[in-house]
Interface confidence: low
């Protein structure tokens, strides 16, 4: 297999000559060999931009209350999300919280719980939304 970088096919040997001079392409890091780059190991490390790093960034392991949304590739870190039945508000650093079991009396559920938001309820009469 080959990867295409800047219209230049580059093989998957241990190191590759960087097409950007001193910078190595995403998915690799600077080698001890001048002008060469080492590829990151799939599932172990990644770099998501052209770089001058001497090592790939380590892949993140999902926390115990999370599951993997997409695996770590050589160019992208692991993406984690809350396990089914739990949620964490967007861009929040808090732990995953259990989804609400139902809506308060007089309200009806209009949106299921997702890994990013709790269920959403609206008043039966007014239709005004309310996040639990």
């Amino acid at each position: 297999a080959t990867i295409k970088l800047h219209d230049q096919s580059i093989g998957t040997q241990q190191w590759e000559h960087s097409p950007l001079g001193e910078l190595c392409p995403p998915g690799s890091h600077r080698s001890e060999h001048p002008g060469a780059c080492n590829r990151c190991t799939e599932g172990v490390g990644y770099t998501n931009a052209s770089n001058n790093l001497f090592a790939c960034l380590p892949c993140t392991a999902c926390k115990s209350d999370e599951e993997e949304r997409s695996p770590c590739t050589t160019t992208r870190n692991t993406a984690c999300q809350c396990k089914p039945g739990t949620f964490r508000n967007d861009n929040s650093a808090e732990m995953c919280r259990k989804c609400s079991r139902g809506c308060p009396r007089g309200m009806v559920k209009v949106k299921d719980c997702t890994p990013w938001s709790d269920i959403e309820c609206v008043h039966k009469e007014s239709g005004n939304g309310h996040n639990i």
Epitope: E67, E68, R69, S70, P71, A79
Partner: antibody
Framework: QVQLQESGPGLVKPSETLSLTCTVS????????WSWVRQSPGKGLEWIGS???????NYNPSLKSRVTMTIDKSKKQFPLKIDSVTAADTAMYYC??????????WGQGTLVTVSS | YVLTQPPSASGTPGQRVTISCAGS????????VNWYQQLPATAPKLLIY???QRPSGVPDRFSGSKSGTSASLAISGLQSEDEADYYC???????????FGGGTKLTVL
Amino acid sequence: QVQLQESGPGLVKPSETLSLTCTVSGGSISDYYWSWVRQSPGKGLEWIGSIDYAGSTNYNPSLKSRVTMTIDKSKKQFPLKIDSVTAADTAMYYCARQLGRISDYWGQGTLVTVSS
Amino acid sequence: YVLTQPPSASGTPGQRVTISCAGSSSNIGGNTVNWYQQLPATAPKLLIYSNNQRPSGVPDRFSGSKSGTSASLAISGLQSEDEADYYCATWDDSRGGWVFGGGTKLTVL
């Protein structure tokens, strides 16, 4: 609720190109991997390939030379093309969303028959 | 098929049945296993993920386990609506892709 819908011609002639499209609704096409899986009549499931939102592909080695997958984020679609089809490509074709290494949502499938 | 499943299994209502899935170090040995249920003339449905986790809505009669390079699906309190084809699936590192078992047709007698 995420829904996936396969569409495309149900009949393809031998040696021609099979073209299918999967349309995603009720959810984002970004941040996920998307797969195609097929099932020949009376047989088991066979993974065809996967694509991520950035267009990075990963194909079944046995089909790699004939398969092309792309993604259109604006239309929320990911098409599949298989070149030089034969009767062996007759199957039910499913598209699915990959949550990490789990296919959690599947389309209902579309049957493609290869015949002259 | 890369993963080996028995082609058929059967049981009477209320019984417990187990379906096996045998692989190798490059697939089941180093990756998590998912199980899919395919009812007649329908698309596969995720039944068990990450070896032993049930998606919401799947009864706790269904359970999964993994040991070494093999996995198994157990169904207790068998019901007539469990009659379906069951497939195991996992990632295969050497092939760089998804692999499935050949499927097991479960008959409720």
